[in-house]
């Protein structure tokens, strides 16, 4: 609340978050030309990244292109890539949509499709839908502590969420543990009013705020966080624009001496945590 | 434009990021001791990291030092590091210029030169120029879609950069698209009065600035934002404080069971998304 | 100082690190059942990870799981997981505290204890104390550069914590130099009243503040930052609410055709960089 | 699925020459060939992209073989000279994305090296 008499300060915050949990993911693997049903367990290392501060990302879907190797072949016959003769391929053209550089020729895709054929990591990535239901669905379930020390430097005033009375095993709930900072990921989405396993396929953005209002006067002190949720990203986004959240990032290794790369498409929720607030003294 | 009689508050952001552009590379690459001249493509997961919110790296540069493996060597003979006899290299000493921890002998680095033995990856990364021109000179023409999602919680006010109808398509340019999103690297760097083929060699930080003035009021209301670059880092700076950006990372493997790594130096653009302004209503 | 007069604008930062140093880490390695001792060298590469903007993490610590498959195994037999019979195994069960799903059976894990089978990356991570001392305590010696360009946009003015006539070979010291912009890390700690060695061994968080307080009126110019140390870690925080700082990465690797992992828990210290101030004008 | 057909295999000497082709039931973009030597596993000899470009040779048979195709038929041959008992494996015609990925195989044809 506004106390005019009170000289405010913006809060300087430093935030910490710690994710646990585990997926089992199901999903169809191909070798030697056989599909079959593969299992396998996602933890922490596998789902998240190592990153700073106010943002962490946990994987909840992923479309892999395995053994790309450097060298020529036909694109990916997307929506208009097609051809039918070497003139519809310019040498030395990169489509923004393409994932190579034309060499000027028109070869076969498959029986029926003939594309340009570019340099590139080969074979190009098949631009699929992210599978549905997402492959880390379950993800819902996972945890995260929030860790959150701020400070009014003017005011020579240092807090954390986090008291010395709390319960390391609670989970955060709006009406009955407000100030538990352990939440459930499908809790935030449930406060911000948003369907996890929907959004899960395509990936988001959440918004996690923390809202300090800090009377650090002695004789009224207060000074305790409060959360909120909001999805950032846009659920109505047109194509274009690149609905959802999600990035491509590569493992590379040789294989008879030849440099090779697994490119994986992570479709996902990064939590954004957005501290906010002011501290007020007479 | 200041109305005195408005309450003024912070904007609280979020940024979201996405590059587009595919670079071909081509460099000496050396064989069994034969030199050719070989030919690479470089699409996003092999050009930038998956990086949170305000920042994006894009890799313009690199200088490879492979096959490395923990033994003992000479080190760089740099200037000043040449010895000629045991009595210049102290046992357990590590200088800060160098890549490894003394072993108190002086070897020979070449048929002329001799250096002091150390402790380190093997061979030690020689200390050579960035390349020029940068070896993804052409990252000039790629692109980068920019989302920002802002919101003034005590007006409870929520907004976004792309609306629904904008064009996908689009490029920004001061006077003729101000409002679109999508920012060609080399544009920014123009409009920053900078030279993008001569920071691509050492690298840089460059600024996006987003800034939002915010009126609220319903009888006047206007909210969107105004887009500024600016470089962030110093040109002119000493060699002693380390101009540029670049920063070293390795792929670790195993081969005939002993671990080797490749330590890429990558030299690049860091952007760096500022968002600032306020909203005031009445 | 306020000067009721002057119109205060909140600052606009962006900051670039760049750590140096070598640390020689001595440590027990098990091969082919022989353990004897390894010495090995860590490089900013091997310690430190491509981060961006306002923190950086520098690893003091680490316990590594070697050759992780994804596979059927007892879970670690950490207080209260063991079993006597599969009566006590719930199959499908995730328990936030193991590393896997179990199976439904109760299994041995050694000649004397009987755990939970799980489907898991196995062997399943040991929950063994991380080691005392720091493996890389000696990163006590490490410097790391800061560079921070500020700006006031309202005030259209830019400046930087680097000035042309600084020394390279400078270090920070509060008295003898307040404004050389390299800083030992163990220095870091002393000012802010903390042990490194202590804190190297679970990790932790540390604030570097630097506080801009600028007068830009051209009679009384002043805008130069100062320099100021806390821990933003809880010491005293209980063990359910994980203290320290550490996260999980694995580097996946195939063998034989089996997809293999190494886990490694790095312990190390954050370091936050938390920039504010004001510049105010007449 | 893409049926493939092996012809020219049999018995031939150190240092003697010999010519497989392979008939391919559909146009591809890349085909190839690969061997299985007995209680080896089958490793990759040649490749030819489309019209013969990009070529791709293991390092063990560059200057011995030449592999060619006719995209009209869509056959792919090859010459093998300079052979050596170590040569003796059962050679697969292939077909596939590029030079370095393939999907199938056919049932494969006897080379033997031998004297």
């Known amino acids: 609340s506004d106390k005019l008499y009170q000289r405010k300060e913006p809060v300087i915050s430093s935030v910490h978050t710690k994710v646990k949990g585990i997926a089992e993911v199901t999903e169809n693997v191909t070798e030697g030309g056989v599909t079959k049903l593969g299992h396998s367990i996602f933890d922490t290392a596998d789902y998240t990244f190592p990153l700073q501060g106010n943002s962490f990302f946990v994987m909840t879907n992923y479309v892999k292109s395995e053994g790309q190797v450097q060298t020529l072949c036909p694109e990916y016959p997307r929506r208009g890539a097609q051809c039918s003769s070497d003139r519809r391929c310019k040498k030395g053209w990169m489509d923004p949509q393409s994932k190579g550089i034309q060499t000027g020729r028109c070869v076969p895709y498959d029986k029926t499709r003939k594309t340009c054929e570019v340099s590139a990591w080969c074979p190009t990535e098949e631009e699929k839908e992210a599978p549905r239901p997402a492959l880390l669905r379950s993800a819902e379930n996972f945890t995260v502590l929030i860790k959150n020390n701020i400070h009014f430097p003017g005011h020579n005033y240092t807090t954390r969420n986090i008291l010395p009375t709390m319960n390391g095993s609670c989970t955060f709930h709006k009406t009955w543990d407000p100030q538990c900072s352990i939440f459930r990921l499908g809790d935030i989405f449930q406060e911000a009013g948003e369907n996890f396993t929907e959004v899960a396929v395509q990936g988001g953005i959440m918004g996690i705020e923390i809202y300090w209002d800090c009377n650090l006067d002695s004789w009224s002190h207060h000074c305790r966080p409060r959360y909120s949720f909001r999805r950032l990203d846009d659920k109505n986004m047109d194509e274009s624009f690149v609905p959802g959240y999600n990035f491509r990032y590569a493992k590379y290794y040789k294989e008879n001496n030849v440099e090779k790369r697994t490119l994986i498409k992570a479709f996902g929720i990064r939590f954004d945590i957005l501290v906010f607030g002011t501290g007020g003294k007479f | 434009s200041d109305k005195l009689y408005q309450r003024k508050e912070p904007v609280i952001s979020s940024v979201h990021t996405k590059v587009k552009g595919i670079a071909e590379v081509t460099e000496n690459v050396t064989e069994g001791g034969v030199t050719k001249l070989g030919h690479s493509i470089f699409d996003t997961a092999d050009y930038t990291f998956p990086l949170q919110g305000n920042s994006f790296f894009v890799m313009t540069n690199y200088v490879k030092s492979e096959g490395q493996v923990q033994t003992l060597c000479p080190e760089y003979p740099r200037r000043g590091a040449q010895c000629s006899s045991d009595r210049r290299c102290k046992k357990g000493w590590m200088d800060p210029q160098s890549k490894g921890i003394q072993t108190g002998r002086c070897v020979p680095y070449d048929k002329t030169r001799k250096t002091c033995e150390v402790s380190a990856w093997c061979p030690t990364e020689e200390e050579k120029e960035a390349p020029r021109p940068a070896l993804l000179r052409s990252a000039e023409n790629f692109t980068v879609l920019i989302k920002n999602n802002i919101h003034f919680p005590g007006h409870n006010y929520t907004t976004r950069n792309i609306l629904p109808t904008m064009n996908g398509s689009c490029t920004f340019h001061k006077t003729w698209d101000p409002q679109c999103s999508i920012f060609r690297l080399g544009d920014i760097f123009q409009e920053a009065g900078e030279n993008f083929t001569e920071v691509a060699v050492q690298g840089g930080i460059m600024g996006i600035e987003i800034y939002w003035d915010c009126n609220l009021d319903s009888w006047s209301h206007h909210c969107r934002p105004r887009y500024s670059f600016r470089r962030l880092d110093d040109k002119n700076m000493d060699e002693s404080f380390v101009p540029g950006y670049n920063f070293r990372y390795a792929k670790y493997y195993k081969e005939n069971n002993v671990e080797k790594r490749t330590l890429i130096k990558a030299f690049g653009i860091r952007f760096d998304i500022l968002v600032f302004g306020t909203g005031g209503k009445f | 100082s306020d000067k009721l007069y002057q119109r205060k604008e909140p600052v606009i930062s962006s900051v670039h690190t760049k750590v140096k140093g070598i640390a020689e880490v001595t440590e027990n390695v098990t091969e082919g059942g022989v353990t004897k001792l390894g010495h090995s060298i860590f490089d900013t590469a091997d310690y430190t990870f491509p981060l961006q903007g306002n923190s950086f993490f520098v690893m003091t610590n680490y316990v590594k799981s070697e050759g992780q498959v994804q596979t059927l195994c007892p879970e670690y037999p950490r207080r209260g997981a063991q079993c006597s019979s599969d009566r006590r195994c719930k199959k499908g069960w995730m328990d936030p505290q193991s590393k896997g799903i179990q199976t439904g059976r109760c299994v041995p894990y050694d000649k004397t204890r009987k755990t939970c089978e799980v489907s898991a990356w196995c062997p399943t991570e040991e929950e063994k104390e991380a080691p005392r001392p720091a493996l890389l305590r000696s990163a006590e010696n490490f410097t790391v550069l800061i560079k921070n360009n500020i700006h006031f946009p309202g005030h259209n003015y830019t400046t930087r914590n680097i000035l042309p006539t600084m020394n390279g070979s400078c270090t920070f010291h509060k008295t003898w130099d307040p404004q050389c912009s390299i800083f030992r890390l163990g220095d870091i700690f002393q000012e802010a009243g903390e042990n490194f060695t202590e804190v190297a061994v679970q990790g932790g968080i540390m604030g570097i503040e630097i506080y801009w307080d600028c007068n830009l009126d051209s009679w009384s110019h002043h805008c130069r930052p100062r320099y100021s140390f806390r821990r933003l870690d809880d010491k005293n925080m209980d063990e359910s609410f994980v203290p320290g700082y550490n996260f999980r990465y694995a580097k996946y690797y195939k063998e034989n055709n089996v997809e293999k992992r190494t886990l490694i828990k790095a312990f190390g210290i954050r370091f936050d960089i938390l920039v504010f101030g004001t510049g105010g004008k007449f | 699925e893409v049926q493939l057909v092996e012809s020219g295999g049999g018995l031939v000497q150190p240092g003697g020459s010999l010519r497989l082709s392979c008939a391919a039931s559909?146009?591809?973009?890349?085909m190839g060939w690969f061997r299985q030597a007995p209680g080896k596993e089958r490793e990759f000899v040649a490749g030819?992209?489309?019209?013969?470009?990009?070529?791709r040779y293991a390092d063990s048979v560059k200057g011995r073989f030449t592999i060619s195709r006719d995209n009209a038929k869509n056959t792919v041959s090859l010459q093998m000279s300079g052979l050596k008992p170590e040569d003796t494996a059962i050679y697969y015609c292939?077909?596939?994305?590029?030079?370095?990925?393939?999907?199938?195989w056919g049932q494969g044809t006897q080379v033997t090296v031998s004297s």
């Open positions: 292939a077909t596939g994305t590029s030079v370095y990925h393939y999907q199938y």
């Open positions: 559909e146009r591809t973009y890349s």
């Open positions: 030819s992209g489309w019209d013969g470009i990009p070529t």
